[in-house]
């Protein structure tokens, strides 16, 4: 009996550039002779529904039909046919199918690839605002993947220590594709010195599938006309 | 920085056990096998076998079959070798040792060594 | 089990003089266009240390005056101008079959 096991819940993440290595366990009830066993790996883009050959091993020759991929000879040995990709593109999520043969028997599993970036974030002021104790504050992400991404404002006083969500003057402006597939966004805080007080802690808070934690960016205003002190980040 | 820690030297008698532990740092623990090679005193060096921390997946060589048992701990990093029915021609210092698996297969990393004593 | 057999098994250098190490494996560690032999080396006291693997790519960190080639069943390192730090004793390794073997160690010493 030949079964094949793939990650569990079917589902594999990895960072974009990164190396990922996509599992795929071969269970045989015999001592595996690599000589006389073929292993093929397959994508199914998310766009395509076209299946490409990404690897292929037959006892006596390996040929990788993407740069870089690879299965360990050594581990196949011990039953491990996992996928070795490195460097991984945004374009290479998808479904993933290893097939493995030992004559005459075949068996197949499928995982799906999510390929993720996470934020790179930064909070400056607007020098361009130019009116009498108005502020105008701006949190950019950039080059996150997936599209989804959550940026919220949050402040805190002296008096008060919780945090209170600002809702109010706040834009957040569309998210803006990249050329290699990654996404850019920027919110907006637009705020009255002469209305708050100096101490007051404000935060961009930013989510996003690709962080385990969602990054804090802090600043503290201080006197009117001198709005931000100088920015911290917490993830 | 890649660091292979191994457990301190050790003094056994004949018929008893002995369990060598090996500490990686430094790098992702299941994207290398880790190898286990031992060194008799004065002599060459001998591949006992590896692992594959990914599955735990073993090959051993044949001479040791049945004695010798690898093991991970991946929630430490950590590699185990153990070795069984001990006999004093398994004096020696026991390495482990990081292996490429994907682009051939060679050991770039080494454990600073334990040394194992089998003396009645 | 592939057997190496490294010549000399002990050799002496004048600091700066070329040396050579053989190894020769009782059949071919070739696989698919790649030599599935590597060199280390074990100072005095130390564990080996990678060379070079693959027979002929330098691992990171190790001086260019090493080198290594040949395929099949004919394997050789040389270190073209021998330093002081360069004493101990070299062994070749074959990883294309199980058991992993290793030759029997050459042992360089300075003049």
């Known amino acids: 009996d030949l079964k094949v096991e793939m990650m569990a819940r079917g589902i594999q993440a990895t960072r974009l550039n990164d190396s990922v290595t996509i599992s795929c366990k071969v269970i045989y009830s015999q001592p595996l002779n690599i000589t006389s066993m073929g292993i093929t790996w397959f994508r199914k883009s998310l766009t395509l529904d076209k299946e490409v050959k990404v690897f292929e091993f037959f006892g006596d020759h390996q040929k990788a039909f993407r740069p870089g991929a690879n299965v360990s000879l050594w581990r196949l040995k011990s039953g491990d046919a996992s996928l070795k990709l490195p460097g991984v593109q945004l374009e290479e999520a998808g479904e993933y199918r290893c097939e493995v043969v030992v004559t005459p028997l075949k068996a197949q599993g499928t995982v799906q690839l999510k390929v993720v970036a996470s934020p790179t974030s930064r909070l400056f002021q607007d020098q361009a605002v130019v009116k009498e104790n108005e502020g105008k504050y701006m949190c950019e992400s950039s080059r996150f993947y997936p599209k989804d991404i959550n940026i919220t404002w949050e402040k805190w006083t002296q008096k008060s220590p919780h945090h209170v969500v600002i809702s109010e003057n706040v834009i957040t402006g569309p998210t803006i594709k990249n050329m290699d597939g990654t996404f850019n966004i920027t919110s907006y805080l637009k705020l009255n010195s002469s209305q708050e007080d100096p101490g007051t802690v404000y935060r961009c808070v930013i989510r996003h599938e690709s962080l385990h934690t969602p990054v804090s960016i802090d600043f503290i205003l201080t006197a009117p006309q001198q709005s931000l002190s100088e920015p911290e980040k917490t993830d | 920085e890649v660091q292979l820690v191994q457990s301190g030297a050790e003094v056994k008698k004949p018929g008893a056990s002995v369990k060598v532990s090996c500490k990686a740092s430094?790098?992702?623990?299941?994207?290398?096998?880790m190898d286990w090679v031992r060194q008799a005193p004065g002599k060459g060096l001998e591949w006992i076998g590896d692992?594959?921390?990914?599955?735990?997946?073993?090959l051993y060589n044949q001479k040791f079959r049945g004695r010798v048992t690898l093991t991970v701990d991946k929630s430490i990093s950590t590699a185990y070798m153990e070795l069984s029915r001990l006999r004093s021609d398994d004096t020696a210092v026991y390495y482990c040792?990081?292996?490429?698996?994907?682009?051939?297969?060679?050991?770039?990393?080494w454990g600073q060594g334990t040394t194992v004593t089998v003396s009645s | 089990d592939i057997v190496l057999t490294q010549t000399p098994l002990s050799l002496s250098v004048t600091p700066g003089q070329p040396a050579s190490i053989s190894c020769k494996a009782s059949?071919?560690?070739?696989?698919?266009?790649?030599?599935?032999m590597n060199w280390y080396l074990q100072k005095p006291g130390q564990p080996p240390q990678l060379l070079i693997y693959?027979?002929?790519t330098l691992h990171s960190g190790v001086p260019d005056r090493f080198s290594g080639s040949g395929s099949g069943t004919d394997f050789t390192l040389k270190i073209s101008r021998v330093e002081a730090e360069d004493v101990g004793v070299y062994y070749c390794?074959?990883?294309?079959?199980?058991?992993?073997?290793f030759g029997q160690g050459t042992k360089l010493e300075i003049k």
């Open positions: 040792a990081r292996s490429e698996v994907f682009y051939g297969n060679y050991a770039d990393y």
């Open positions: 430094g790098y992702t623990f299941t994207d290398y096998n």
């Open positions: 692992i594959n921390p990914n599955n735990g997946g073993t």
């Open positions: 059949q071919s560690v070739d696989y698919d266009g790649d030599s599935y």
């Open positions: 693959a027979a002929s």
């Open positions: 390794q074959q990883s294309k079959e199980d058991p992993r073997t």
